[in-house]
């Protein structure tokens, strides 16, 4: 695929796929698979629709658009680096060898850990944890109050440890983006 779609670890990824139903409600089966489109069907199917509804899906994979209008774009929830790769959207138009198939490349980037240039004495124990999420529109930032409190000792050493890849991985795995200041 010569175009690519991008998301950060912990975000939702969006892979567009559209077709035009012959008439409203006259739907065509569609399958989504991980890996390039094979000759028939989809390999490693993650979601499938039939003439009426979504009839198979796996966790984290769903259709966010109006699939009854032909918007069969795939949303992958809370992505990890392992979600990178080629995905196949196959529109299974009736007839022999009539399917329309599209390969879309998904690139997952590590979540950014972004310390602001704030002096250490300005840190407070009440510092919020932020999770950046993305839907179809602009990114929005939410404060997650449910994460465990980070104590003063952790805060005081955080700036020095941010370059430590193990900490960065821990932060990524938690889905949190720490903003200091």
């Amino acid at each position: 695929s010569e175009v690519e779609y991008r998301a950060e670890v912990g975000q939702n990824a969006y892979l567009p796929c559209f077709y035009t139903p012959a008439a409203p409600g006259n739907l065509v089966p569609v399958c989504w698979g991980k890996g390039a489109c094979p000759v028939f069907e989809c390999g490693n199917v993650v979601l499938r629709t039939d003439e009426r509804d979504v009839n198979y899906w796996t966790s984290r994979y769903w259709l966010n658009g109006d699939f009854r209008k032909g918007d069969v774009s795939l949303t992958i929830e809370n992505v990890t680096l392992a979600d990178s790769g080629i995905y196949c959207c196959r529109i299974q138009i009736p007839g022999i060898m009539n399917d329309e198939k599209f390969n879309l490349k998904l690139v997952i980037k590590p979540a950014k850990v972004t310390p602001a240039p704030t002096r250490q004495r300005d840190f407070t124990a009440a510092f919020p944890r932020m999770l950046t999420t993305r839907g179809h529109g602009p990114a929005e930032t939410q404060t997650l109050g449910s994460l465990p409190d980070i104590n003063l000792t952790q805060i005081s050493t955080l700036a020095n440890e941010l370059r430590d890849s193990r900490l960065a991985n821990d932060l990524r795995d938690s889905g949190a983006t720490i903003r200091i200041g």
Epitope: E2, V3, Y5, Y14, P16, C17, F18, T20, G65, K69, G70, D71, S73, C89, I93, G95, M97, N98, D99, E100, K101, F102, N103, L104, H136
Partner: antibody, heavy 117, light 107 residues
Framework: QVQLKQSGAELVRPGTSIKLSCKAS????????INWVKQRPGQGLEWIAR????????YYNDNFKGKATLTAEKSSITAYMQLSSLTSEDSAVYFC??????????WGQGTLVTVSA | DIVMTQSHKFMSTSVGDRVSITCKAS??????VAWYQQEPGQSPKLLIY???YRYTGVPDRFTGSGSGTDFTFTISSVQAEDLAVYYC?????????FGGGTKLEIK
């Protein structure tokens, strides 16, 4: 690299038909839509129709049903658009463009069609 | 049919300026919007797909944003070679439709 090479300019009489060609190279012809787009002199772009050469599925803009007919020949990796019952309103540049589910990434150079008595 | 409206037919700008072109869809089209540049006598060229993704080889001064019905195309620092007509297009549903075009003129 991906290329779409269109047939040359045509001067035709009103009431006649014409068949424009668009030869593809540099990619798998059967895996992408070929779209046709009309542009009258000094005007904007108007989508005519598309064909998916892998299965020969076609969709037409209602404004061009009965005017345009799309075909594709896998052996020669060429898409065609026939325009029938030509009038002065059909005088325009016609582009073919390769597309998928994410817009028209590659365009032919265009074919100028002039309909004149 | 989905109507794509570009509010300005012409925009005049100077080299180095930031310019934004807007496009409004008559109904929601998710992010299925592309932006094209057409230089005089040339074929259109894809700049932005899926509302905000820059196509391969397109300079990073070109950006796109929006979803639903309102879309914006921005050139952060206009260059002389950017003199062209810019079109938005929706490919959410057939018939695919283009905006009327915005001609960028350099002062």
């Amino acid at each position: 690299q991906v290329q779409l090479k269109q047939s040359g300019a045509e001067l035709v009489r009103p009431g006649t038909s014409i068949k424009l060609s668009c030869k593809a190279s540099g990619y798998t012809f059967t895996d992408f839509y070929i779209n046709w787009v009309k542009q009258r002199p000094g005007q904007g772009l108007e989508w005519i129709a598309r064909i998916y050469p892998g299965g020969a599925n076609t969709y037409y803009n209602d404004n061009f049903k009965g005017k345009a007919t799309l075909t594709a020949e896998k052996s020669s990796i060429t898409a065609y658009m026939q325009l029938s019952s030509l009038t002065s309103e059909d005088s325009a540049v016609y582009f073919c463009a390769r597309g998928a589910n994410w817009a028209f990434a590659s365009w032919g150079q265009g074919t100028l069609v002039t309909v004149s008595a | 049919d989905i109507v794509m409206t570009q509010s300005h037919k012409f925009m005049s700008t100077s080299v180095g300026d930031r310019v934004s072109i807007t496009c409004k869809a008559s109904q929601g089209v998710s992010t299925a919007v592309a932006w094209y540049q057409q230089e005089p006598g040339q074929s259109p060229k894809l700049l932005i797909y899926s509302a905000s993704y820059r196509y391969t080889g397109v300079p990073d001064r070109f950006t796109g944003s929006g979803s639903g019905t309102d879309f914006t195309f921005t050139i952060s620092s206009v260059q002389a070679e950017d003199l062209a007509v810019y079109y938005c297009q929706q490919y959410y549903n057939t018939p695919y439709t283009f905006g009327g075009g915005t001609k960028l003129e350099i002062k």
